[in-house]
Interface confidence: medium
Amino acid sequence: DGCKDIFMKNEILSASQPFAFNCTFPPITSGEVSVTWYKNSSKIPVSKIIQSRIHQDETWILFLPMEWGDSGVYQCVIKGRDSCHRIHVNLTVFEKHWCDTSIGGLPNLSDEYKQILHLGKDDSLTCHLHFPKSCVLGPIKWYKDCNEIKGERFTVLETRLLVSNVSAEDRGNYACQAILTHSGKQYEVLNGITVSITERAGYGGSVPKIIYPKNHSIEVQLGTTLIVDCNVTDTKDNTNLRCWRVNNTLVDDYYDESKRIREGVETHVSFREHNLYTVNITFLEVKMEDYGLPFMCHAGVSTAYIILQLPAPDFRAY
């Protein structure tokens, strides 16, 4: 059918509560496109009727709520004027009761469900709630070990729980809860978060900051050589790895045979309160297959991408 397949992340989800996934792939969905969701290679699209428990809402697939039998591979097909991409998303539904004493046994929980607080610092936890505009979320409540958090060190700011003067006792099992309203019906969303404590603080008490790139595209001619720097600020005593990845693989590994695209040697400049790190990516010869791929700069938990695109004159006929 001429569609290019892109395999995205696996999502591990809790049954009996709402879930939504947005079909976005930066180089594709930024222009004029149509998006259609399918389940398990079915030829019949997911319903767009808002009363359906599972339905498509603009570019989103929405489950109200998610059920045990909803596990499977979902595809969203993104059709542009001259392109077609099929994104595969593997959804695994598990029965999870966050107040069970047995918190273990969850395979490969995403980073949204594993968060870190920095000892002795003011820090925060984030409640990841990704839903379309049609879903209205009420105020978030936070729980630790199934008790609502009300201590003087905790303040709620939108989707974040601010924690003052983090202590070792703050590690443990948290949950954030919100009431979601859709078409007059209310649903409870409860996300569990496993919190660990680290003594290492980031730059200014936060994560590394990627100064460049900024999730943007770069126009480059086919066949040319290109070097792009990733500039990162971080604490002097940080232990973060800085690297370039493509398709979630280190570029040096991904292009191990051809060595056409390579990561450069990291350099840094020392400032009074932080270091500025630079690590580049070199494209010895830009090929057609490089266009539209997000090349990701990683610095600890921070990421930013560049996308190569053909220069504007090539598109004038469109």
Partner: antibody, heavy 119, light 107 residues
Framework: QVQLKESGPGLVAPSQSLSITCTVS????????VHWVRQFPGKGLEWLGV???????DFNAPFKSRLSINKDNSKSQVFFKMNSLQIDDTAIYYC?????????????WGQGTLVTVSA | DIVMTQSQKFLSTSVGVRVSVTCKAS??????VLWYQQKIGQSPKPLIY???YRHSGVPDRFTGSGSGTDFTLIISNVQSEDLAEYFC?????????FGPGTKLELK
């Protein structure tokens, strides 16, 4: 000791923008957040926004579109800018900082700068 | 947003008496409440944090109490220097919000 001091224009014409600088001493902006609060002539206090130690910001919802807060850690200065001022933005504008222990919100305030919006 | 209400706009008192300033939150804020004192021409000065803990240097005639939605600031032996405006503030949930203030004045 911990000090914060605001410096502003005093008088701003309607629809113009307001810029205030908060210069701090006795602590580092890399370790503490700085909040902005204003007090109306009728004495009511309103929280406007905050710049965190890492430079990220959060704002009171009604001000998100017309407020920006930046800082220069090396100069120990925080820069507050509010656009499209109206008569009812007339107030004393304060920068403030939490105390060094939990719960001690706004233990330290600047002296405030009176901003009058008038043609 | 959480609304903080101080029903007494003015409170008339005499030196040496005991006075209570009250504050009510529109929803449960635990003990995440502060009290400030403000004198004319000055910035607010913190008195009480976490509903009942005195800031350093605050005389022990100032006492805070309450949790949930109802909070009280008690000045047990009013002095002339206590004549000022008193504000409560919640920090349970952003946006941080303040009460409208209670002005303590001489009868």
């Amino acid at each position: 000791q911990v000090q914060l001091k605001e410096s502003g224009p005093g008088l701003v014409a309607p629809s113009q923008s307001l810029s205030i600088t908060c210069t701090v001493s006795g602590f580092s902006l890399t370790n503490y957040a700085v909040h902005w609060v204003r007090q109306f002539p009728g004495k009511g206090l309103e929280w406007l926004g905050v710049i965190w130690s890492d430079g990220s910001t959060d704002f009171n919802a009604p001000f998100k579109s017309r407020l920006s807060i930046n800082k220069d850690n090396s100069k120990s200065q925080v820069f507050f800018k509010m656009n499209s001022l109206q008569i009812d933005d007339t107030a004393i504008y304060y920068c403030a900082r939490k105390g060094g222990y939990s719960g001690s919100w706004f233990a330290y305030w600047g002296q405030g700068t009176l901003v009058t919006v008038s043609a | 947003d959480i609304v903080m209400t101080q029903s007494q706009k003015f409170l008339s008192t005499s030196v040496g008496v005991r006075v209570s300033v009250t504050c009510k939150a529109s929803q449960d804020v635990g003990t995440n409440v502060l009290w400030y004192q403000q004198k004319i021409g000055q910035s607010p000065k913190p008195l009480i944090y976490s509903a009942s803990y005195r800031h350093s240097g605050v005389p022990d005639r100032f006492t805070g109490s309450g949790s949930g939605t109802d909070f009280t600031l008690i000045i047990s032996n009013v002095q002339s220097e206590d004549l000022a405006e008193y504000f409560c503030q919640q920090y349970s949930r952003y946006p941080l919000t303040f009460g409208p203030g209670t002005k303590l004045e001489l009868k």
